[in-house]
Amino acid sequence: RKIPKVGHTFFQKPESCPPVPGGSMKLDIGIINENQRVSMSRNIESRSTSPWNYTVTWDPNRYPSEVVQAQCRNLGCINAQGKEDISMNSVPIQQETLVVRRKHQGCSVSFQLEKVLVTVGCTCVTPVIHHVQ
Amino acid sequence: GITIPRNPGCPNSEDKNFPRTVMVNLNIHNRNTNTNPKRSSDYYNRSTSPWNLHRNEDPERYPSVIWEAKCRHLGCINADGNVDYHMNSVPIQQEILVLRREPPHCPNSFRLEKILVSVGCTCVTPIVHHVA
């Protein structure tokens, strides 16, 4: 899908807009809010009833090169006694983010935007019961 | 920036790091993944730490619509459907990259922006405060 025009109307293109070749767009990868910090509750991945681990994926041809993925530790959820309760399910919560992919074609380099699905953490859910006819 | 492996046959002038500004194809790879979390799963209703999804829309951003989760309760829902306050519902937050139109309103000029979104909620045991 192409990036949509601003809103749903055709805005007047401001005079200050840079010239861009057809079929492409200019992207500044100096990140706005680069230094903001996540203020998530302390070590929730361990305190959760659906705990998870983190793994870092690394790809030098991707920007950002490092993407952190969560994996649920259990199929069930952890009960008050610290035991796994398989009557409940730990499930992944996912979120899309954008990355820039660098592609080499011979000696020329091109850049492509890519949507990546990141598993952020896990939550404990009641299972769906399928009734057999 | 980040270093990339260099093709030995290419001229040496190539920068090892990502340049500050790049020209990218207007088509986005993997664009068909579902962006509406309400349609992709009903975890937000079935979770012991259920959440509501709030639509955040900004035409100067791509994607223009982002769904923000807000935990419905401070406690967690137990097997009887009651709220347990000896457990807490907390948001799971994630930094994501989006495109911000720069300069504003320009159709094909963007800058990457990092934003913090609450994706869902999880049920946690409360923090133990040790009194000195």
């Epitope: - | 509501n52 807000k70 709220v83 347990d84």
Partner: antibody, heavy 118, light 113 residues
């Protein structure tokens, strides 16, 4: 200073509906929950239900059998409790009280007396 | 629902003497993960809303005189007024906030002998 100010006393006929407001100030309304408690003469304190204005979740006491509805307006930092199908035994003082993530209810409104009489 | 019981229903104590109120819950209010008991004690005077005195069984709220103390764990709890003052005449309630529906004890009326 945290304050919860409730609407004034009401006199209602059996079968009617009453809606009481509770205006919060002195704290971030969406960071806490609002609980409602009934105190009927000779019946002690009865928890009715709770709302989390920041997340929209509600929970109710089944003893009120679907007659109670709790809402919140985050634009005015006000919580509401509506009790329908009123009967004489609903004559009571109704309190709103702020709850935290541990369920601690530390600040209470001044109470609203509802009298149900034909 | 968790049932809360209190004893005695009422008691009369001389000024400066000790008053002890007991509260029992039908199930444990102890959260093993943080070792907290989700039990609160309230004081209510005529025409006023309840006032939180003690929470988590033994944590006194700020501004509450130190003659008030709470103790107990699991299902058995006690509120003690070490030296009764005239302004302590009131009804005292215990309440569990472990799970909904929150439930209160029937109250204990404290008077001066």
């Amino acid at each position: 200073e945290v304050q919860l100010v409730q609407s004034g006393a009401e006199v209602k006929k059996p079968g009617a509906t009453v809606k009481i407001s509770c205006k919060a100030s002195g704290y971030t309304f969406t960071d806490y929950e609002m609980h409602w408690v009934q105190q009927a003469p000779g019946h002690g304190l009865e928890w009715m239900g709770v709302i989390h204005p920041g997340g929209g979740g509600t929970a109710y006491n089944q003893k009120f059998k679907g007659r109670v509805t709790i809402t919140a307006d985050t634009s005015t930092d006000t919580a509401y409790m509506e009790l329908s199908s009123l009967r004489s035994e609903d004559t009571a003082v109704y309190y709103c009280t702020r709850g935290d993530h541990d369920g601690r209810t530390d600040y209470w409104g001044q109470g609203t007396l509802v009298t149900v009489s034909s | 629902d968790i049932v809360m019981t209190q004893s005695p229903d009422s008691l009369a104590v001389s000024l400066g003497e000790r008053a002890t109120i007991n509260c029992k819950s039908s199930q444990s209010l102890l959260n093993r993960s943080n070792q907290k008991n989700y039990l609160a004690w309230y004081q209510q005077k005529p025409g006023q809303p309840p006032k939180l005195l003690v929470d988590f069984a033994s944590t006194r709220e700020s501004g509450v005189p130190d003659r008030f103390s709470g103790s107990g764990s699991g299902t058995d709890f006690t509120l003690t007024i070490s030296s009764l003052q005239a302004e302590d005449v009131a009804v005292y309630f215990c309440q569990q906030h472990y799970t909904t529906p929150f439930t209160f004890g029937p109250g204990t009326k404290v008077d001066i002998k």
